[in-house]
Interface confidence: low
């Protein structure tokens, strides 16, 4: 339905508080280097303008699109050229090209300082002194570091952030109350950002059809009692929501997400029996809860799939009449019967089915040709099952840190050209699959593990896309969204790689390592491990383990020494020499 003023429409729908928060997120996700104060000024100007449009929708400029209004505002930033370089050229373009240009300049790895958490008392004072600014700063800092963060979900995180400070700054032991909550929000936030990044990559790199296929599979697993028509409606609406958010249309996205939550709750009887508690919550919690809701129970006595999709004489007729609808029905029926499969596996099966029909429906005897199509699924199902079994056994044997190290070595040998920080970050995250998924029973392991790995490998893909260094990574990332994990799994040691020159500086450590947290110390050691493999890609597991054990002992010894710095200097030289000898460097 058309509105005279889009900005007035969204302001009224969302309310001033959410409107301001979402505009701040949008601006911070576009201009990631701008100071906080500049963004707040821009947001206030937009908000004041929106209020004039609410008062009179016919007022000057109120009929302009949100992209035009926001783009014009961003292009008033004085330092655009010196801060952002060629992004300033976007401002010479007209909409919609200007917005597309801004989107293309979003940086997944912006050169921003690490967020350092102040002392609890300092944070509580800041919170009480100016709560509004404190919470805006949170939105700004997260949004600029995560330019694809799902905006309505970030409002939910901010609400929990506020609640944590509200409760804990009054507690007897503020730190004991607050720090675990902040750690949880940080970890959940990183996971949420990465999941949304995959959705945006799916839409932007592989198109709406790929996203819709993913959504059909996931929603059919989650809502197996819902009719195909109901699932299709939800998929259409969900696709619109994510297309908007990934496209920077955050006000529309948040508004449409609220409408979708409302629709789901009004129609929960025909969607899922698991929605009741979610639907009793306030809006932000409700939307989050629905997105995370457990799978409903499968209907009893579902008929065999073969009847409609293999044995029926109408398979090719039904396929020809509406290919995507028929394939959507296949995916829906398969997914609702298989909550134990990963979404990417279900999509591989649907792709195999599609390829078979494309070939067989043109053959002399189509039925004879596709009669054994389900037999082709067996190896596709067994491959991830076996891989997960092997890796969970390895995880249980090694524990998370050493399992991460095994993956670090594995992936550095596969793609040694990738930067060390990226290899460390991605391999650490890949390694977390163990503690996240291996504890689950067999029926939940695959959806947990393989869909999580898709999210992590997408991080590798988006970071690599910024600075491409490996044809193998490019190939695995761009050929097929659903086959990314099997593609990386299949990579062997890169025999074309020329080992890196040995540089003693890379393996020189100082006393500051002793004051680092356990996590940061692990990252230091894992960085050294990647560098070792880059110098000696043919080193055996045993050789690397010996060197890493020596390294751990060296750090422990020098951190206990009276003169730590001297110890690191002298013992470090000995360690480098011993390692060179052990690895033949």
């Amino acid at each position: 339905d058309a509105h005279k003023s889009e900005v007035a429409h969204r302001f009224k729908d969302l309310g001033e508080e959410n409107f301001k928060a979402l505009v701040l997120i949008a601006f911070a996700q576009y201009l990631q280097q701008c100071p906080f104060e500049d963004h707040v000024k821009l947001v206030n100007e937009v908000t004041e303008f929106a209020k004039t449009c609410v008062a009179d929708e016919s007022a000057e400029n109120c009929d302009k699109s949100l992209h035009t209004l926001f783009g014009d505002k961003l292009c008033t930033v004085a330092t655009l050229r010196e801060t952002y370089g060629e992004m300033a050229d976007c401002c010479a373009k007209q909409e919609p090209e200007r917005n597309e240009c801004f989107l293309q300049h979003k940086d997944d790895n912006p050169n921003l300082p690490r967020l350092v958490r102040p002392e609890v008392d300092v944070m509580c004072t800041a919170f009480h002194d100016n709560e509004e600014t404190f919470l805006k700063k949170y939105l700004y800092e997260i949004a600029r570091r995560h330019p694809y963060f799902y905006a309505p979900e970030l409002l939910f995180f901010a609400k929990r952030y506020k609640a944590a400070f509200t409760e804990c700054c009054q507690a007897a032991d503020k730190a004991a109350c607050l720090l675990p909550k902040l750690d949880e929000l940080r970890d959940e936030g990183k996971a949420s950002s990465a999941k949304q990044r995959l959705k945006c990559a799916s839409l932007q790199k592989f198109g709406e059809r790929a996203f819709k296929a993913w959504a059909v599979a996931r929603l059919s697993q989650r809502f197996p009692k819902a009719e195909f028509a109901e699932v299709s409606k939800l998929v259409t609406d969900l696709t619109k929501v994510h297309t908007e958010c990934c496209h920077g249309d955050l006000l529309e996205c948040a508004d449409d997400r609220a409408d979708l939550a409302k629709y789901i709750c009004e129609n929960q009887d025909s969607i899922s029996s698991k929605l009741k508690e979610c639907c009793e919550k306030p809006l932000l919690e409700k939307s989050h809860c629905i997105a995370e809701v457990e799978n409903d129970e499968m209907p009893a006595d579902l008929p065999s799939l073969a009847a409609d999709f293999v044995e029926s004489k109408d398979v090719c007729k039904n396929y020809a009449e509406a290919k995507d609808v028929f394939l959507g029905m296949f995916l829906y029926e398969y997914a609702r019967r298989h909550p134990d499969y990963s979404v990417v596996l279900l999509l591989r099966l649907a792709k195999t089915y599609e390829t078979t029909l494309e070939k067989c429906c043109a053959a002399a005897d189509p039925h004879e040709c596709y009669a054994k199509v389900f037999d082709e699924f067996k190896p596709l199902v067994e491959e991830p099952q076996n891989l997960i079994k092997q890796n969970c056994e390895l995880f249980e044997q090694l524990g998370e840190y050493k399992f991460q190290n095994a993956l670090l070595v594995r992936y550095t040998k596969k793609v040694p050209q990738v930067s060390t920080p990226t290899l460390v970050e991605v391999s650490r995250n890949l390694g977390k699959v163990g503690s996240k998924c291996c504890k689950h029973p067999e029926a939940k392991r695959m959806p947990c593990a393989e869909d999580y790995l898709s999210v992590v490998l997408n991080q590798l893909c988006v970071l690599h896309e910024k600075t491409p260094v490996s044809d193998r990574v490019t190939k695995c990332c761009t050929e097929s969204l659903v086959n990314r994990r099997p593609c990386f799994s299949a990579l062997e040691v890169d025999e074309t790689y020329v080992p890196k020159e040995f540089n003693a500086e890379t393996f020189t450590f100082h006393a500051d390592i002793c004051t680092l947290s356990e996590k940061e110390r692990q990252i230091k050691k894992q960085t050294a491990l990647v560098e070792l493999v880059k110098h000696k890609p043919k080193a055996t597991k045993e050789q690397l383990k010996a060197v890493m054990d020596d390294f751990a002992a060296f750090v422990e010894k020098c951190c206990k020494a009276d003169d730590k710095e001297t110890c690191f200097a002298e013992e470090g030289k000995k360690l480098v020499a011993a390692s060179q000898a052990a690895l033949g460097l």
Partner: nanobody, 123 residues
Amino acid sequence: QVQLQESGGGLVQPGGSLRLSCAASRFTLDYYAIGWFRQAPGKEREGVSCIASSGGSTNYADSVKGRFTISRDNAKNTVYLQMNKLKPEDTAVYYCAAAVLECRTVVRGYDYWGQGTQVTVSS
């Protein structure tokens, strides 16, 4: 530990009025939605009214609309329930409860509860 204390209950004749207070100690009510609930003997606890942390949003059970008014005084760290035109069926123990920021639609959505105050409407 967060504490809520109700007061203002008592015996009143039908058609009379009472004003219940819910005072918080050891924490500030500014960031909490406060709900009033009641429980009559042998019945489940039911929502009566709620006011959001901002004070801008209030809601009432159908049975008390037009008779009860909820308000808050953040300076006094207290929320009030003004009850007019009381009826015998309003007889119950009245409880106040707090939830961060927004009203909840279910009893279990509230984090902190008071001990309750008895209201008896009888001639």
